[in-house]
């Protein structure tokens, strides 16, 4: 099938980095500047992606592969192939319709991206709050309140103090 295809379609012989030029008897012409073809047999070359503004060039365009972009400092990539650049916020904030805003009470964000999430509800697991939550950190859950009742402590009691003047046996 490949042989018959190449006999019927001279374009199939055009390698990546070229295109099959209908205006020149279907000969293989190199992709013009700022364009590429990543596969053989193409009738056109694709325009190279341009990394402008908040997008920075991570990899230059070549005749056989598109440019790749990342984001300028203070922004992070979103989407496949860094299709978007989104502003970083501080920990304890989220990006809203009006920019970076502090997390509401009862929520936190420990990253420079993403949304504020509710603190863990320790009581759902039958535990108590060991360390309070902040805008930047989730609460830390500790043992259940029952575990902390008198006589039920799991903490090892300190060794009894020796009387003065007694040396270890």
């Amino acid at each position: 099938f490949e042989r018959t295809r190449s006999l019927q379609d001279p374009c199939s012989n055009c390698p990546a980095g070229t295109f099959c030029d209908n205006n020149r008897n279907q000969i293989c012409s190199p992709c013009p500047p700022n364009s590429f073809s990543s596969a053989g047999g193409q009738r056109t070359c694709d325009i190279c992606r341009q990394c402008k503004g908040v997008f920075r060039t991570r990899k230059e365009c070549s005749s056989t592969s598109n440019a790749e972009c990342d984001c300028t400092p203070g922004f992070h990539c979103l989407g496949a192939g860094c299709s978007m650049c989104e502003q970083d916020c501080k920990q304890g904030q989220e990006l809203t319709k009006k920019g970076c805003k502090d997390c509401c009470f009862g929520t936190f964000n420990d990253q420079k991206r993403g949304i504020c999430r509710p603190w863990t509800n320790c009581s759902l697991d039958g535990k108590s709050v060991l360390v309070n939550g902040t805008k930047e950190r989730d609460v830390v859950c500790g043992p259940s309140p029952a575990d902390l009742s008198p006589g039920a402590s799991s903490v090892t009691p300190p060794a009894p103090a020796r009387e003065p003047g007694h040396s270890p046996q």
Partner: nanobody, 122 residues
Framework: EVDLVESGGGLVQPGGSLRLSCAAS????????MSWARQVPGKGFEWVAY???????YYADSVKGRFTISRDNAKDTVYLHMNSLKFEDMAVYYC????????????????WGQGTQVTVSS
């Protein structure tokens, strides 16, 4: 071909004013939300102001009350009126389309101008 050309930058004293313009061509300007962003050397980009196709606006806290973004759909131009300029406003200012319409976010199909320098100096 899409083109955005900024103008109006220059040298101004603290407390002074400037009006930046961004002339657009190659797309249906009135249908697009537009943005101004700035880049301070060594500090990266920050968004400054946005204007929707219907004329509603958003401003960064750092420029609120001092800067005004506006658009003239008949002239395919977006403006940034800058008053009470401060030393910290010194930057290269860029005009860009704003397809995502999410503050602080641009996508790969947005178009950017070449930028215009604003220098604040006494």
């Amino acid at each position: 071909e899409v083109d955005l050309v900024e103008s109006g930058g220059g040298l101004v004293q603290p407390g002074g004013s400037l009006r930046l313009s961004c002339a657009a061509s190659g797309f249906t300007f009135r249908s697009y939300a537009m943005s101004w962003a700035r880049q301070v050397p060594g500090k990266g980009f920050e968004w400054v102001a946005y204007i929707y196709s219907d004329g509603s606006t958003y401003y960064a806290d750092s420029v609120k009350g001092r800067f005004t973004i506006s658009r003239d759909n008949a002239k395919d131009t977006v403006y940034l009126h800058m008053n009470s300029l401060k030393f910290e406003d010194m930057a290269v200012y860029y005009c860009a389309t704003w397809r995502s319409q999410q503050v602080g976010r641009w996508d790969e199909y947005d178009h950017w101008g070449q930028g215009t320098q604003v220098t604040v100096s006494s």
